[in-house]
């Protein structure tokens, strides 16, 4: 048995658990999900037994092999998958373990503004980027675009300081997970520093 293989899939998508076997005479192959049998294959009789009806349309073995393709992925398909190859020529089954992480395609991140101070024409505040549905394993970066600077900032919180009379700055939050990325609406420093309460066009 080899090291644990990590796989990533997206909700609604498909993933293939690769299986390469050197075993000559295979009696049966059993795929398991979190200790629950998923599929049993008996190559001799060409029998494939899918344990749960709801998985019947989601399970496939492409190209006539034994690699398992799981379609129409759901969030709760995340977990540990295990395959055992049983053969009379082996003293104990040949095994392989997989960990599947299923991620949602990210929606547009939401930006909120912290307490704002506007002293002597300099506006100081924090912008916080977050996902409304609390998606997992999201990495946030900020892009600051404008004549004054083109730079990136890692993390969900962006501290900003913008002077009246300064070149306009546009801030965009980029949210990423292993399967997708999405962008917040662009936020103009000059509009932000006016205060969203006054600004019907506020991009937040």
């Amino acid at each position: 048995s080899g090291p644990v293989k990590e796989l990533v899939g997206s909700v609604g998508g498909a993933v293939t658990f690769p299986l390469k076997s050197k075993v000559k005479q295979v009696d049966s192959i059993v795929w398991t999900f979190n200790t629950t049998p998923l599929v049993t294959i008996q190559p001799e009789g060409g029998t494939i037994i899918v344990t749960q009806n709801r998985n019947r349309e989601r399970v496939d073995f492409p190209d006539g092999g034994y690699s398992l393709k799981l379609s129409k992925l759901k969030k709760n398909d995340s977990g540990i998958y295990y395959v055992g190859i049983y053969s009379s020529s082996l003293q104990q089954p040949s095994t392989q373990e997989y960990v599947l992480h299923v991620y949602e395609h990210l929606s547009k991140p939401k930006v909120t503004m912290g307490l704002q101070s506007n002293k002597n024409g300099t506006c100081v505040t924090n912008l916080t980027c977050c996902m409304e549905h609390g998606e997992e394993d999201v990495i946030y970066t900020w892009k600051a675009l404008g004549q004054a600077a083109n730079e990136s900032h890692n993390g969900s919180i962006l501290p900003i300081s913008w002077r009246w009379g300064e070149s306009d700055m546009t801030f965009i939050c980029v949210a990423r997970n292993p399967v997708s990325r999405n962008f917040s609406s662009p936020i103009l420093a000059r509009k932000l520093c006016e205060g969203a309460a006054d600004d019907p066009d506020s991009s937040m």
């Epitope: 506007n118 002597n120 009246w164 000059r190 520093c193 006016e194 006054d198």
Partner: antibody
Framework: EVKLVESGGALVKPGGSLKLACAAS????????MSWVRQTPEKRLEWVAT????????YYPDSVRGRFTISRDNARNTLYLQMSSLRSEDTALYYC???????????WGQGTLVTVSA | DIKMTQSPSSMYASLGERVTITCKAS??????LNWFQQRPGKSPKTLIY???RLVDGVPARFSGSGSGQDFSLTITSLEYEDMGIYYC?????????FGAGTKLELK
């Protein structure tokens, strides 16, 4: 083309009041800060007031604070400066000005003359 | 308030000459300074913003430099249309303050 046209300048007695207006066209008026800047007879430029795009924030130097009020009507694309308790040192050519996305005072009107004299 | 001291207050120069005008801030203003030109009978016009950035459409003979407290505007080869008054403006903080101006006249 950005156009700023000031009006309302006049000869006024010390202690009197006056309201200036600036009609704006050719740009998204409600999206930009607007300012008043004056030029004295000695040709000095003095910043007078600034109002933010939605009218929420206003800024003044000490020399006019409490006497002048800047306001705007975004529906009419018009900027105003209400001046009261006028003094001889307020005599100047009053310009309205706005910014572009890169810098302040990118566009200026032609000015309106305010003379405070007995 | 930040005081902007501009010098000289007036100067005479010949066509083709190199001209430098300076502006000194009473405290550190980083690069938060703009330069304006006002031709006779006209409204002021921005030449340079953020101390050294040339406004689109302004001839390349104009340049700005400096940061902190000391700034300068240079015209490499003076032309007739450059006559007028030049002002600096600090926008590091309110109140915004202008220099007193430099009147540039033809020698």
């Amino acid at each position: 083309e950005v156009k700023l046209v000031e009006s309302g300048g006049a000869l006024v007695k010390p202690g009197g009041s006056l309201k200036l207006a600036c009609a704006a066209s050719g740009f998204a008026f409600s999206s930009y800060d607007m300012s008043w800047v004056r030029q004295t007879p000695e040709k000095r430029l003095e910043w007078v007031a600034t109002i933010s795009s939605g009218g929420r924030n206003t800024y003044y130097p000490d020399s006019v604070r409490g006497r002048f009020t800047i306001s705007r009507d975004n529906a009419r694309n018009t900027l105003y400066l209400q001046m009261s308790s006028l003094r001889s040192e307020d005599t100047a050519l009053y310009y309205c000005a706005t910014r572009n996305s890169n810098y302040a005072f990118a566009y200026w009107g032609q000015g309106t003359l305010v003379t405070v004299s007995a | 308030d930040i005081k902007m001291t501009q010098s000289p207050s007036s100067m005479y120069a010949s066509l083709g000459e190199r001209v430098t005008i300076t502006c000194k801030a009473s405290q550190d203003i980083n690069i938060y300074l703009n330069w304006f030109q006002q031709r006779p009978g006209k409204s002021p016009k921005t030449l340079i913003y953020r101390a050294n950035r040339l406004v689109d459409g302004v001839p390349a003979r104009f340049s700005g430099s400096g940061s902190g407290q000391d700034f300068s505007l240079t015209i490499t080869s003076l032309e007739y249309e450059d006559m007028g008054i030049y002002y600096c403006l600090q926008f590091d903080e309110f109140p915004l303050t202008f220099g007193a101006g430099t009147k540039l006249e033809l020698k």
